[in-house]
Each structure stands twice: as C-alpha cells, then as structure tokens.
C-alpha cells in the first residue's frame, strides 16, 4: 500500500508512517515503528504538556515568585501550567503575568470607573458636573454634590470636581 501523506487526528507522520501522539501530561520517548506503538512517558513533578504532542521534553511549571508580588491562582498539573496572579492591591504588568505593579490611584477630581483586579489596573474618569472627589483613591467613585435644597438650605459656595458645595441657611426677608 501507498505510504500515507496525512494522518488522523492525534497522530503524526514519521518515516512514512502514522504514529500516535502522546497525550497531555506525557512526553515522547520513541516513535512508533511497523511493529511497536509510540512510547510515551509521564512528565516529571513540576513539569507539564498541555496538548497531544510529540515533544521530547516537558515544559517547566511557571513559578509565581512572591518577591515579584505574584501568587498562585491555579496550581500546575502534569497537563496544565501554573497560573499566576498578583497579591491584593497589585496587578499584572503583562498577559503572561510575570510581575506585578501597585494599583493606580485616581487623583482628586477623578473617580474610579473600574476597580483594579489581579490582571487589570484601576480605570479613572473625570468627575462630571455635579460630582466631586477630594481624595486620591483606588476605590472611591465620584460623589454627587450635596443637595442643599433637600436640607432646606441654599448654596453658599459652588462645588467643583474636587470639592462639594457648601450649604448655608436661607436669608429670611424681614417683615
């Protein structure tokens, strides 16, 4: 019969022959022959392979180095790599999460639009008219100006994006 030019899923072509790939968590020791099956061996502890493969070496698990602000989100297995994330108050500097930086704070005049996570930084937004923020914070949203009217008071000092309005008593007209 004609030697194959393509192989089925989970197989690979070698020496004009289709051999079985090694399953996730195992590496290739020797290719199959006309008489023998592919020989695979489990990955060692702290190693992994996450696909059907013909790799002769397993990959090492990622190390979530606490000195870089990292911690383990998901422990590595023979079939999956370790997933790292950042300690509370920090976020990853890249998608691979190889190191962490402190969450950004929103300056006075700006409020938090989206609180930071282990993988994304704080998103700030300027306080619109009618709102203010007088602190630098990674959590505080813009607060609405105090409504003097609902307290039976009048505005004595207008609010800004950094300060609240100042309310005061209404001037009574003398009879």
């Amino acid at each position: 019969p004609e030697p194959p030019t393509a192989c089925r899923e989970k197989q690979y072509l070698i020496n004009s022959q289709c051999c079985s790939l090694c399953q996730p968590g195992q590496k290739l020791v020797s290719d199959c022959t006309e008489f023998t099956e592919t020989e695979c061996l489990p990955c060692g502890e702290s190693e992994f392979l996450d696909t059907w493969n013909r790799e002769t070496h397993c990959h090492q698990h990622k190390y979530c180095d606490p000195n870089l602000g990292l911690r383990v989100q998901q422990k590595g297995t023979s079939e999956t790599d370790t997933i790292c994330t950042c300690e509370e108050g920090w976020h990853c500097t890249s998608e691979a999460c190889e190191s962490c930086v402190l969450h950004r704070s929103c300056s006075p005049g700006f409020g938090v639009k989206q609180i930071a996570t282990g993988v994304s930084d704080t998103i700030c937004e300027p306080c619109p008219v009618g709102f203010f923020s007088n602190v630098s914070s990674a959590f505080e949203k813009c607060h609405p100006w105090t409504s003097c009217e609902t307290k039976d008071l009048v505005v004595q000092q207008a609010g800004t994006n950094k300060t609240d309005v100042v309310c005061g008593p209404q001037d009574r007209l003398r009879a």
Epitope: D50, H61, T77
Partner: antibody
C-alpha cells in the same frame, strides 16, 4: 516501601530556632515535590511549605513566611525545615509529605515530629 | 485563601450504615485546563499520620476499599462510606489541592454508635 521519617523536633523557647529533617527512602526522592504540614495538639491540619522536585519552586503559608525555610538535598534523600523566631502557636506535630507529578496530591506522609514552643 | 468548610464536625454511625461527609470550598476547585476538580480527601486514624484516600474529587487511591467514594464539583463535595466498618473510625479531612496556600477542612470525626 515508601518511607518518610521526620526528626529534629523537641522543646524550644519562644524566639528560638529548630531544624527539622525528613529522611526519604523506597522511592526516587528527586522525582517528587515535598511538603511540610503541621497539626497543633487536638487540632486540624495546616499546610506549611512546598518545594518542587528540582528545588526551583518554593511556596510558604503566610503564617510562616520570613521565619521558616524549606530546603532539600536530593543527593542525601533529605528534606529540611529551618524554623526561626518560633512562637507558641508553632507548637505542633510536623509531617513531611510527598507530592507526585501525576495526582499532584500528598500521597505519602511521615509519622511526624513534635515541636513544642514554650518558656 | 480558599476556605474549606466541612460538616458535620463529628458523627456516630452504626456498623454497616452509610456515612456522608460534606465539604464546601469558598471558590471553585475546577482546573480550567484539564476540567478536573482538585479536591482531595485524607483519612487520619487515631495516633497515625494522615493517609491519602481520594484525589481529583472521586478517584480512589490504590488500595482504598470501594466502600469509599467521592463526588461533587465546583465548590460542593461529598465523601461517602457506603457501609461503615470498625477500621473506618478516623477523622476525615477534605483539602483544596487547586491552589496555594493548600487548605484543609476542619475535619469530621467518624465514630461507631
């Protein structure tokens, strides 16, 4: 037969130090990750530290971080736990346990060694 | 940290009766890559070290009698002893094997009524 034998426990004063050892036999020590787990008298289990088969990866519980150091010597089939700045709350039986590269679970435990921190 | 909550704290059951121990984790123990739940059960008999009983939620360790079974997924797990034997008197611990720090449930003491 897999065997893990802990030693080095004893009575120590608060602020003192102790070095625990775990002698492994009956398996290829350098192929396994290792853990220390402790158990205070009459209490449950508390994970302390982990070291990977090749020494590359080390993790600690927050309660011991900066005070305890896990290490291993694959040539001597031995695991160690250096314990400094000991506190009364570190009083416990300390177990070493191995982790294989398949289950990723602690599949064998030693008999434990008792550490007592008291003045 | 993942908090593991076991219930009940203790129970006394007659020989041959069924035992059910529950374990709840504060977050999912499902590994997104291989779809396995990394929940482990250990058995600790009086005066002995713990012994691995079940890993990946439901896979019995070699040599563990088939009266022991594990089930569950995500955050809710169960250990069942189908017919309690005298040698099953022990404290049973569930354990998060999904992430560091590894965390244990408070334990469930099983006694004979």
């Amino acid at each position: 037969e897999v065997q893990l034998v802990e030693s080095g426990g004893g009575l120590v004063k608060p602020g003192g130090s102790l070095r625990l050892s775990c002698a492994a036999s009956g398996f290829t020590f350098s192929d396994y990750g290792m853990h220390w787990v402790r158990q205070a008298p009459g209490k449950g289990l508390e994970w302390v530290a982990y070291i990977s088969s090749g020494n590359r990866i080390i993790y600690y519980a927050d309660t011991v971080k900066g005070r305890f150091t896990i290490s291993r010597d694959n040539a001597k089939n031995s695991l160690y736990l250096q314990m400094n700045s000991l506190r009364a709350e570190d009083t416990a039986v300390y177990y070493c346990a191995r982790q294989d590269g398949y289950r990723y679970a602690m599949d064998y435990w030693g008999q434990g060694t008792l550490v007592t921190v008291s003045s | 940290d993942i908090v593991m909550t076991q219930s009940p704290d203790s129970l006394a059951v007659s020989l041959g009766e069924k035992v059910t121990i529950n374990c709840k984790s504060s977050q999912s123990l499902l590994n997104s890559g291989n779809q396995k739940n990394y929940l482990t059960w250990h058995q600790q008999k009086p005066g002995q070290p713990p012994k691995l009983l079940i890993y990946w939620t439901s896979t019995r360790e070699s040599g563990v009698p088939d009266r022991f079974s594990g089930s569950g997924s995500g955050t809710d797990f169960t250990l069942t002893i189908s017919s309690l034997q005298a040698e099953d008197v022990a404290v049973y611990y569930c354990q998060n094997d999904y992430t560091y720090p590894l965390t244990f449930g408070g334990g469930t003491k099983v006694e004979i009524k």
